[in-house]
Interface confidence: low
């Protein structure tokens, strides 16, 4: 199970994971205390025909070939949380670690 | 966590859960003993800003907008195993549980 | 046998427009990235313009950004370079090549199609 | 832009000669590069891949070698149909770019 790293200056139009920082000062999220900047990573690029497929299904719904079925598409296979502080709905200081956040690694299905 | 379900006579347009039949014998996959076939489901629809984004990762991407980011598809984002009878690459008669063939929830992520 | 078949060249004014085709055959073409490389008579080979399988990312050399525009049909096997404002040093046999990472890196040319720009 | 550097630009030698040709980038190109052959008249053909890779049904003679920023193309016996001139490019960003070329002549 892999995945390719790609970055902004990559010749490779395949599916591949890409730096991406994620400022929640410049979005306006004030409610986030830390931290104000970190490294979330993103998945762009094409899924061709078995490249970087994470699970047989999808090469058996491209054999199928149903309506509507657009084919994979790149999207995270591997994902991390990050520690994060933050004020919820009540105006409470929260500690926690917050699912999903990072794409690790990214693949077509 | 929810997904939509659909059928072929569904008139939504977002992101949704079909309905698929998966033939082995139709496609000539000859080393599966059982089953013939089996209900694999596939995933299709569009994904509008923040519908059934299974990530807030999904979400800060949108508001990053990275070069190349082509927002989030419409993909699997619960899946169960099937339980298979095959001959392996030995023409070994193997029974064993195969992870991921059959689509359980629909997301956009 | 995988072909590719460049046609659409000949001789046009300055200023003028042309419009090459490239037809493919033999592999699948709605796999592959195609690119477009050119030759001044006497010269060296130059990139000039590239685009994914499904037309998702398009790249240009910046000595013809802005004047020639890339695209395909993959529903026809074609690749397609249309040539506008077109100057003296334009003038180049135009080869197309077809592309998918390094594997598949321009592993396959067309014989060519001669672009003469002059007045 | 990433710029190749090609040298030589021409070279003459004999048959049976052990020929080399060094391709240098401006910056690390990790091994994303290939080397290509052509004749008058002829469109390229792909003879090395990924720096050292040999095109099936190139001659065993042709071989690659280098990463990051140097990069050899040697034929290890030169053959009178080895008369080309013989380019560079690197695909590790846009825009691609071909090396300058090196015309290879058999005395």
């Known amino acids: 199970d892999f995945g390719l790293d790609c970055d902004e200056h990559s010749t490779e139009s395949r599916c591949c994971r890409y730096p991406l920082t994620v400022d929640f000062e410049a979005f306006g999220w004030d409610w986030i205390i830390a931290p104000k900047r970190y490294k979330a990573n993103y998945c762009s690029g094409e899924c061709e025909f078995v490249f970087l497929q994470k699970y047989p299904h999808t090469h058996l719904v491209h054999q199928a070939n149903p309506r509507g079925s657009a084919g994979p598409c790149c999207t995270p296979t591997k994902m991390s949380p990050i520690n994060m502080l933050y004020f919820n709905g009540k105006e409470q200081i929260i500690y926690g670690k917050i699912p999903a956040m990072v794409v690790d690694r990214c693949g077509c299905s | 966590d929810f997904g939509l379900d659909c059928d072929e006579h569904s008139t939504e347009s977002r992101c949704c859960r079909y309905p698929l039949t998966v033939d082995f014998e139709a496609f000539g996959w000859d080393w599966i003993i059982a089953p013939k076939r089996y209900k694999a489901n596939y995933c299709s629809g569009e994904c509008e800003f923040v519908f059934l984004q299974k990530y807030p990762h999904t979400h800060l991407v949108h508001q990053a907008n990275p070069r190349g980011s082509a927002g989030p598809c419409c993909t699997p984002t619960k899946m169960s195993p099937i339980n298979m009878l095959y001959f392996n690459g030995k023409e070994q008669i193997i029974y064993g549980k195969i992870p991921a063939m059959v689509v359980d929830r629909c997301g956009c992520s | 046998e995988v072909q590719l078949v460049e046609s659409g060249g000949g001789l046009v004014k300055p200023g003028g427009s042309l419009r090459l085709s490239c037809a493919a055959s033999?592999?699948?073409?709605?796999?592959?990235?195609m690119n477009w490389v050119r030759q001044a008579p006497g010269k060296g080979l130059e990139w000039v313009s590239s685009i994914s399988s499904s037309s998702s990312y398009i790249y240009y050399a910046d000595s013809v950004k802005g004047r020639f525009t890339i695209s395909r049909d993959n529903a026809k096997n074609s690749l397609y370079l249309q040539m506008n404002s077109l100057r003296a040093e334009d003038t180049a046999v135009y080869y197309c090549?077809?592309?998918?990472?390094?594997?598949?890196?321009?592993?396959?040319w067309g014989q060519g199609t001669l672009v003469t720009v002059s007045s | 832009d990433m710029q190749m550097t090609q040298s030589p630009s021409s070279l003459s030698a004999s048959v049976g000669d052990r020929v080399t040709i060094t391709c240098r980038a401006s910056q690390g190109i990790r091994n994303d590069l290939g080397w290509y052959q052509q004749k008058p008249g002829k469109a390229p053909k792909r003879l090395i891949y990924g720096a050292s890779s040999l095109q099936s049904g190139v001659p065993s003679r042709f071989s690659g070698s280098g990463s990051g920023t140097e990069f050899t193309l040697t034929i290890s016996s030169l053959q009178p149909e080895d008369s080309a001139t013989y380019y560079c490019?690197?695909?590790?960003?846009?825009?691609?770019?071909f090396g300058g070329g090196t015309k290879v002549e058999i005395k």
């Open positions: 490019l690197q695909h590790n960003s846009y825009p691609l770019t």
């Open positions: 033999g592999f699948t073409f709605s796999s592959y990235s």
């Open positions: 090549a077809r592309d998918r990472g390094s594997y598949f890196l321009f592993d396959y």
